[in-house]
Amino acid sequence: QEFHFGPCQVKGVVPQKLWEAFWAVKDTMQAQDNITSARLLQQEVLQNVSDAESCYLVHTLLEFYLKTVFKNYHNRTVEVRTLKSFSTLANNFVLIVSQLQPSQENEMFSIRDSAHRRFLLFRRAFKQLDVEAALTKALGEVDILLTWMQKFYKL
């Protein structure tokens, strides 16, 4: 059982554990999200992502979650259960990112560029909100990310 993001294979990640970690904090996160009209991982970001694009996109999205979302939210929360869940998610995201090696070949430029444009839509939506609201919303949308990642999961 592994993820196949196009040519990038990811082993050793158990999606069950990601869902368990997310569900442990979902109600808290989504209750704190007051801006229900906006969405960060909107349709245009994740809809019809080709296999070739998927490796670039998941790499940039998960790196953003690690460097911006988990890192900043970790400093803002003291609730042990919440910290434990975010730690599980973050550790698994690190494991995924560490196995992703998107091709930097020139012929992949258009695919890389398409994936980057999708990521920029997400980042722009994130930056339009104030920091606290953006972090909360990004965490509350981890289920959208996990659901999309299933498309690349192989039994």
Epitope: Q1, V14, P15, Q16, K17, L18, W19, E20, W23, A24, Q43, L46, Q47, N48, D143, I144, L146, T147, W148, Q150, K151, F152, Y153, K154, L155
Partner: antibody, heavy 119, light 108 residues
Framework: QLQLVESGGALVQPGGSLRLSCAAS????????MSWVRQAPGKGLEWVSH????????FYAESMKGRATISRDNAKNTLYLQMNSLKSEDTAVYYC????????????WGQGTQVTVSS | SYELTQSPSVSVALRQTAKITCGGD??????AQWYQRKPGQAPVMVIY???RRPSGIPERFSGSNSGNTATLTISGAQAEDEADYYC???????????FGGGTHLTVL
Amino acid sequence: QLQLVESGGALVQPGGSLRLSCAASGFTFDDYAMSWVRQAPGKGLEWVSHISGNGESTFYAESMKGRATISRDNAKNTLYLQMNSLKSEDTAVYYCAKDDYGSGLYAYWGQGTQVTVSS
Amino acid sequence: SYELTQSPSVSVALRQTAKITCGGDNIGSKSAQWYQRKPGQAPVMVIYSDNRRPSGIPERFSGSNSGNTATLTISGAQAEDEADYYCQVWDSSANAAVFGGGTHLTVL
């Protein structure tokens, strides 16, 4: 070899209670979320309930909320569904299913157990 | 709540191609599964994660999912493919699995 064996189905009167069991073998039970899915006579498949591998997260279909409790005993590799205040519309074959992603990827199903609610 | 719509029945001539569709609001953003159910038997997953085939499932079964429609295609339908087929997704906003109403495939 992976196996899911349901039991506990019976003929029960409206308003009655029933506990279904699903004995699992051939895989590391607590690594996987599990669900109950049912099929009423002449109807389609209907999801009933879901429980995460660690048992901490449980979800129910609207039609069963407040009347059903899903649980698991990971030491015994067994999944349960306790149903109360049974109605005639609960008459169905109840299947347990192994979830291979954690959010509704049912790669393996048991053979089902028949629940009939009738006076 | 999220709903999936399937046509009740589809007929196909032996060895021809059958297409069974499943409609849902922006279903393309979700992962779709397809299950085959024959009378007196437990359901069998024939497609998962939109287009992946579990081991043991014949190559004639394939899937796609985009926009508001997921599609199960059986290329060169065989007599043994006559069954009910159900699409299914996970609705993460409701924490619930959702099944379509089912399509009965008749192989003529």
